[in-house]
């Protein structure tokens, strides 16, 4: 018995499309072997029409495709523009056509429903609007106009010109009689339901001289578009429902059990907790279209999504909708990266951001996810030297370690820095990752003075105390600027006395500025790193003033009196316009998993996709 399974019978009508899903055991061999769709001949052979290796028969050219979903153990054959010639017996299978790893499918394409003569066919999508036009003659101009629906053998009145409306159509139907010049009346039905489909009869007059017109209304349920994205990647649903619903609340929902479609996000401000920090609803265009970006795709995100428009901001019968079936590929090309990074007030975090290594020249960005309204992600820093004004001196985006990863360092942390941040580039939109920064109890590991004032022309020495846990790390001082932090020479002055219970492995490393000039004013960081992987940092602002008394300045920790929350940038710092991400290509991604490299106290944070084991920074 073959392990392949699928629909034994598929019945459709001419002009339609079919999507035939074939299921196979998702073993490693099966996932990667050839998939095919072939037509069985009278003599028992099976002629390939389409295969996963790119072959498409001339009979299927331009109207069929075969998509393999290895993670789910399925492949889907889509065939469009069906004709009766497509009726027959087929096989969907794996490997070689004659091998027997296949399933028999009978496809029957019929002519479609027989229609009465002079029947006008209206084909309209679910939730949309149809206008049924009904011509009449002059003698019936003043007579009653009506529309009936054929239910079984009997016509049932739907609406008439005397004001009757069938309860099934209340609030969504109207009868318009055109001006005297036009011998035509129209019935407009909004928010079409599947149950509205069927044969209609419009009539002017009630006697033997009445004018009648037959109409066949076909209400189409949207075929779900198949979307296949990588675990930890991102997906964008583009929803274009038409200008007629431009001012109606929009939503994206995910179908769960039965009839339920749980709102993921809507324009009324609702957002499902599972998507907190990793979803954005793009502002809609004038035509009512909008898009929703979900990052950090998880296995459980797979499923059927609907976008629609309804005043309630959720799915209701008659909502115009679009549908997607999202598959999440667990064999992801996107590496695991931390999803939660912990830091302490006054301390720092170093976040590793993955990007597509083929796009090393792309611009890198980091933005702060804001949940207000539909969500937005204003940029904080980019790799081209732009840093948001409020973050000057405490935020840096480094191209290191490179080869598919960049680093973002944020120091002088306060409770206000807690939240979700997105790593993204102007390249591959699938490589967008989300990291949550949590501020936890604890003291910063690196100790530096709070306020430092240097005197023009003199020498300044600024200490940085490193606890013994960093004994194996490279220690450095650098001067911060918009494009990074330029390394400066520093001196190891031996063990530090700033730590209780810390042995000879603690270190005091000083930055010395000789013959201070105005150009020396600014932010200085001391930090630790291992190769190209950065750990904790501490920041000091050095102000430069005129000489008052001779000599050099040696700053001690006693002067570190400013609390981290009190650090305020000089008002003279230039203000750069707040950049917010509008382009959906610049939206971000993801919740990821443990980084195996245990760095220092973990200011890089090793984390899991559900954030159940979070590793913190600056606190151990």
């Amino acid at each position: 018995k073959s392990p392949i399974f699928g629909p034994e019978e598929v019945n459709s009508v001419e002009g339609n499309s079919v999507s035939i899903t074939c299921y196979y055991p998702p073993t490693s061999v099966n996932r990667h072997t050839r998939k095919y769709w072939c037509r069985q001949g009278a003599r028992g052979g099976c002629i390939t029409l389409i295969s996963s290796e790119g072959y498409v028969s001339s009979k299927y050219a331009g109207r069929a495709n075969l998509t393999n979903f290895p993670e789910n153990g399925t492949f889907v054959v889509n065939i469009a523009q069906l004709s009766q010639d497509d009726s027959g017996r087929y096989k969907c299978g794996l490997g070689i056509n004659s091998r027997g790893l296949s399933f028999d499918v009978s496809l029957e394409v019929s002519q479609g429903p027989g229609l009465l003569n002079d029947t006008k066919v209206y084909t309209v999508d679910l939730g949309r609007t149809v206008t049924i036009n009904c011509p009449f003659k002059t003698e019936n101009a003043q007579k009653r106009k009506s529309l009936y629906k054929q239910i079984g053998l009997y016509p049932v009145l739907v609406i008439d010109s005397s004001g009757y409306v069938n309860p099934n159509y209340t609030g969504r139907i109207r009868l318009d009689i055109q001006g005297t010049g036009q011998l035509l009346f129209s019935v407009v039905i909004n928010q079409l339901r599947l149950s509205d489909a069927g044969q209609y009869l419009c009539q002017a007059g009630d006697d033997s001289n009445s004018n009648k017109k037959n109409a066949d209304l076909q209400v189409l349920k949207p075929e779900p578009e198949l979307v296949y994205e990588d675990l930890r990647g991102s997906v964008t649903f583009h929803c274009a429902l038409g200008p007629e619903v431009a001012n109606v609340a929009k939503f994206l929902c995910r179908q769960s059990s039965g009839e339920n479609c749980d709102v993921v996000v809507n324009t009324l401000g609702k957002r499902a907790p599972a998507f907190e920090g990793r979803i954005l609803l793009n502002p809609q265009d004038k035509d009512g279209s909008f898009s929703v970006v979900i990052t950090g795709l998880r296995k459980e995100d797979a499923g059927r999504y609907l976008c629609g428009a309804h005043s309630d901001g959720q799915l209701q019968e008659g909502s115009p909708i679009q549908a997607w079936q999202l598959f999440v590929n667990e064999e992801s090309t996107i590496p695991r990266s931390p999803t939660v990074v912990k830091g302490v007030a006054g301390g720092s975090v170093a976040v590793l951001c993955p990007y597509n290594r083929k796009e090393s020249k792309s611009i890198k960005y980091w933005c702060l996810w804001e949940g207000a309204q539909n969500g937005r992600c204003p940029l904080l820093v980019d790799s081209e030297g732009w840093v948001k004004a409020q973050y000057e001196g405490r935020l840096s985006l480094l191209e290191e370690p490179g080869n598919g990863t960049f680093t973002v360092i944020l120091n002088q942390l306060t409770s206000r820095d807690a939240g979700f941040y997105w790593c993204l580039t102007n390249g591959d939109t699938l490589w967008r990752t989300t990291v949550e920064i949590k501020i936890i109890e604890g003291e910063p590991n690196l100790k530096v003075p709070g306020n430092v004032t240097a005197v023009l022309g003199e020498t300044l020495k600024v200490p940085c105390h490193f606890p013994c846990k960093f004994s194996s790390y490279e220690k450095y001082w650098c001067k911060w600027n918009n494009t990074g932090c330029q390394a400066l020479p520093s001196q190891d002055e031996g063990p530090s006395k700033a730590f209780v219970n810390c042995d000879e492995n603690s270190r005091l490393v000083s930055l010395t500025l000789n013959l201070v000039t105005r150009a020396d004013e600014g932010w200085y960081w001391c930090g630790v790193k291992q190769g190209h992987f950065y750990g904790e940092t501490a920041a000091v602002y050095v102000a430069v003033e005129e000489r008052k008394a001779a000599g050099s300045r040696d700053v001690s920790l006693a002067k570190a009196d400013a609390a981290p929350d009190e650090k305020v940038l000089d008002s003279g710092f230039r203000e750069i316009e707040n950049k917010a991400i509008q382009d959906p290509r610049l939206f971000a991604e993801e919740k990821a998993v443990a980084d195996t490299r245990d760095q220092a106290d973990g200011s890089r944070a090793s984390v899991d996709s559900g954030s159940s084991e979070e590793q913190g920074g600056s606190s151990r």
Partner: nanobody, 127 residues
Framework: EVQVVESGGGLVQAGGSLKLACAAP????????MGWFRQAPGQEREFVAA???????????YYADSVKGRSTISRDNAKNTVYLQMNSLKPEDTAVYYC?????????????????WGQGTQVTVSS
């Protein structure tokens, strides 16, 4: 709460026929798939047949090997009803037959993908 209600079960002789019906008045456009499952005494519930309708005049019918060629699943969308016509019945077809509905278009044989279930109708085939 959306409900489905089965009917048409009963006692039939081997070789006979039976037509089961499942009414799902509460299900609207999102009920893409309706399925039949059965459970014999002391056995696990197993897939029998399923039918999808894509809203555009296309039907997909799935059958278990055990009933292939002897059963036909169909649905009347106007009545929100699905039917299972069973012919050439065998004693081993004796079971409680359940109707189920799902919006999840994964493998139709997987029980836990069906969110809505009926109470079942007993089919007994005597030899």
């Amino acid at each position: 709460e959306v409900q489905v209600v089965e009917s048409g079960g009963g006692l039939v002789q081997a070789g006979g026929s039976l037509k089961l019906a499942c009414a799902a008045p509460g299900l609207t456009f999102s009920s893409y798939r309706m399925g039949w499952f059965r459970q014999a005494p002391g056995q696990e519930r197993e897939f029998v047949a399923a039918i999808d309708w894509n809203g555009r005049g296309t039907y997909y019918r799935y059958y278990a090997d055990s009933v292939k060629g002897r059963s036909t699943i169909s649905r009347d969308n106007a009545k929100n009803t699905v039917y299972l016509q069973m012919n050439s019945l065998k004693p081993e077809d004796t079971a409680v037959y359940y109707c189920a509905a799902t919006t999840v278009l994964t493998d139709p044989r997987v029980l836990n993908e069906y969110a809505t279930w009926g109470q079942g109708t007993q089919v007994t085939v005597s030899s």
